[in-house]
Amino acid sequence: EPPTACREKQYLINSQCCSLCQPGQKLVSDCTEFTETECLPCSESEFLDTWNRETRCHQHKYCDPNLGLRVQQKGTSETDTICTCEEGLHCMSESCESCVPHRSCLPGFGVKQIATGVSDTICEPCPVGFFSNVSSAFEKCRPWTSCETKDLVVQQAGTNKTDVVCGPQDRQRA
């Protein structure tokens, strides 16, 4: 009796179970009573990443330098090419089809995580005791100057955008 369902990595055709093609290969012809499924490898610029009965391999992604992209990992017959962005840029989306410049953290904010080719700069507000007076994609919030260690006193309080201003201690005469 012909099968109605097939095992894993098989498919049903002409009332018989044929093997799927392994990753990196495409289907050329179904199995017959005489021969196994006919599969052929994907050509150099193509891939298939699953057990399949695809008749065409997928083209490797092109990392377009005009969009700020470069190859992070070259594709194989079983994997797609992975693109990333040139320095100073990051991917606009998870699929990384184009790049945008890293954002800078404004004064009052510091860099929590420096941007990579695939993620943007993460900024955080400078907490009390820290400040940032520049717009930067690299600089963290810096601590206020400790006037005491310089044997000075705070003459002007710091903010999240400015450092404290230290000055000499007032010497009271006896």
Epitope: V28, E36, E38, R56
Partner: antibody, heavy 117, light 111 residues
Framework: EVQLEESGGGLVQPGGSLRLSCAAS????????MCWVRQAPGKGLEWVAC?????????YYASWAKGRFTISKDISKTTLYLQMNSLRAEDTATYFC?????????WGQGTLVTVSS | DIVMTQSPSSLSASVGDRVTITCQAS??????LAWYQQKPGQAPKLLIY???KLASGVPSRFSGSGSGTDFTLTISSLQPEDFATYYC?????????????FGGGTKVVIK
């Protein structure tokens, strides 16, 4: 019964055209690669062209066949075709249709094409 | 394009003999090689595919071996019905297209 049956061969003058057909039956035509192979009288086998019979329709040609010969298929009729133009005496051969690409697991009996004036 | 060189072009042998036919590809074709048997007035019949896999229904006296560029068809003990012409067939990608080629054939005749 699983079979391939060629037709359309015959006598044609040099420079003429001919269209060969291959009717497939007994298997799922649309999920197979189908090819034409020819054999000149008393000579060896020579690959002509192949096509994936499904929707993708990927085609493959021998370098000498490009331009003069065109392979095509009709899924609804489960039929493979070979359009041959500008025929020459050296195209005289038995033309076989076959299933497969890296191996030919099923063959028709062939149709004879004679190019002569 | 790929070229398949088959040798010998003919050989004479007796029933019971061990027969070996070789096929060389002009470039590596991995294991994508098939062997066929053809008798006069008939279509070729697939014997071996993927270099060493026996097509169903083919007697076990036929075997294939090899990979890359060098391949062999062996008939361990020649039978009367084995007198025929044998062809190898290889294929490989040429750019993004696939190209098929046959060897010139080996005619096995009775000694």
């Amino acid at each position: 019964e699983v079979q391939l049956e060629e037709s359309g061969g015959g006598l044609v003058q040099p420079g003429g055209s001919l269209r060969l057909s291959c009717a497939a039956s007994g298997f799922d035509f649309s999920s197979n690669t189908m090819c034409w192979v020819r054999q000149a009288p008393g000579k060896g086998l020579e690959w002509v062209a192949c096509i994936y019979a499904g929707s993708s329709g990927s085609t493959y040609y021998a370098s000498w066949a490009k331009g003069r010969f065109t392979i095509s298929k009709d899924i609804s009729k489960t039929t493979l075709y070979l359009q041959m133009n500008s025929l020459r005496a050296e195209d005289t051969a038995t033309y076989f249709c076959a299933r497969g690409l890296s191996r030919f697991s099923l063959w028709g009996q062939g149709t004879l094409v004679t190019v002569s004036s | 394009d790929i070229v398949m060189t088959q040798s010998p072009s003919s050989l004479s042998a007796s029933v019971g003999d061990r027969v070996t036919i070789t096929c060389q590809a002009s470039q590596s074709i991995s294991n994508y090689l098939a062997w066929y048997q053809q008798k006069p007035g008939q279509a070729p019949k697939l014997l071996i595919y993927d270099a060493s896999k026996l097509a169903s229904g083919v007697p076990s006296r036929f075997s294939g071996s090899g990979s890359g560029t060098d391949f062999t068809l062996t008939i361990s003990s020649l039978q009367p019905e084995d007198f025929a012409t044998y062809y190898c067939q290889g294929g490989d990608y040429y750019g993004s297209s696939y190209v098929v080629a046959f060897g010139g054939g080996t005619k096995v005749v009775i000694k």
